[in-house]
Interface confidence: low
Amino acid sequence: EVEKTACPSGKKAREIDESLIFYKKWELEACVDAALLATQMDRVNAIPFTYEQLDVLKHKLDELYPQGYPESVIQHLGYLFLKMSPEDIRKWNVTSLETLKALLEVNKGHEMSPQVATLIDRFVKGRGQLDKDTLDTLTAFYPGYLCSLSPEELSSVPPSSIWAVRPQDLDTCDPRQLDVLYPKARLAFQNMNGSEYFVKIQSFLGGAPTEDLKALSQQNVSMDLATFMKLRTDAVLPLTVAEVQKLLGPHVEGLKAEERHRPVRDWILRQRQDDLDTLGLGLQG
């Protein structure tokens, strides 16, 4: 902690400006009023303070707001956010999406830090659910965000938010997560016509049951092999050769290259050889 010392004559800060970069740590502590700092936080980012000086400024805010910073201060923290600990952030009540965006911007380009994870957790819990705007924002900064949530956490995502999800946001999701997301996506996109529906639902199909795959096979969707390979094995096994052929359309020839991999391998073993022969791919059951 910085030792309490009287501010030298004429050094009392009237505003937060560049002259403060020449202040020693003890001078900042003695000469900068915490209330002034709080009202002029937006200026701090424009001033090239050292990390040590930022430590002093943080200390002053901590003293002024021992129960946690108000949102008016949080929104303008800028690089001072990098000095916050998860424990500090747990005291905050962040409700504005603009505040969240401002702080995520500071950490942009880096892996999700414990601070950011705590901030997001506080924000989402404060809102009660992952609404569309929040999901839009979080996946823009962290494409893998959705797949970092547990199935239990994903259950709080309302179907309307699914519109914000892009295919790349689901790249790292495992089957248990897709099991939760797929029914929400199905509900969200239910009023779309066949081809448009398939475009939207495609990324979520790793959670689809057999009956839905059978329905899709009747709609000329031409599913690509990459999508087919991500389907649940237990959902693929009951499909007939004709259904798989209709489901894949022109991509059905790709089954040959994948015949040793799940779910294709297990599916092949379930089919009659006569049926497999109709594909003309030389698949051996």
């Epitope: 495609q202 990324s203 690509d224 022109p250 020839e253």
Partner: nanobody, 125 residues
Framework: EVQLVESGGGLVQPGGSLRLSCAAS????????MGWFRQAPGKGLEGVSA????????VYSDSVGGRFTISRDNSKNTVYLQMNSLRAEDTAMYYC??????????????????WGQGTLVTVSS
């Protein structure tokens, strides 16, 4: 190295026809979906048509359906776009693309990894 070279563009009057070609090399042409895209002056890139490697499941955008025909000759490693009943709004730079990305539709502009340099089509009287 993947190479796509478009040709066949030019100036044509409304109602006229053109046939674009895209010669491909550096990859197994017969196993890849090929797509045609275009970008009109001041506009974004849009999908026109795409053809899977089996020549089944061909797709066209609503704006060209019935007027344009896509085809491919796997022995020549070439994909074609026959454009009939051309309109002023068909004026654009036309590009062919290949190496489809998973999880995208055949006419999605983010659905392909490799692109040609383009050939200019101008429809004007």
């Amino acid at each position: 190295e993947v190479q796509l070279v478009e040709s066949g563009g030019g100036l044509v009057q409304p109602g006229g026809s053109l046939r674009l070609s895209c010669a491909a090399s550096g990859f197994t042409f017969s196993r890849n979906t090929m797509g045609w895209f275009r970008q009109a002056p001041g506009k974004g890139l849009e999908g026109v048509s795409a053809i899977p490697y089996t020549s089944t499941g061909i797709v066209y955008s609503d704006s060209v359906g019935g007027r344009f025909t896509i085809s491919r000759d796997n022995s020549k490693n070439t994909v074609y776009l026959q454009m009939n009943s051309l309109r002023a709004e068909d004026t654009a730079m036309y590009y062919c693309a290949t190496d489809r990305r998973p999880g995208t539709t055949m006419l999605a502009v983010n659905g392909y990894n490799h692109w040609g340099q383009g050939t200019l089509v101008t429809v004007s009287s």
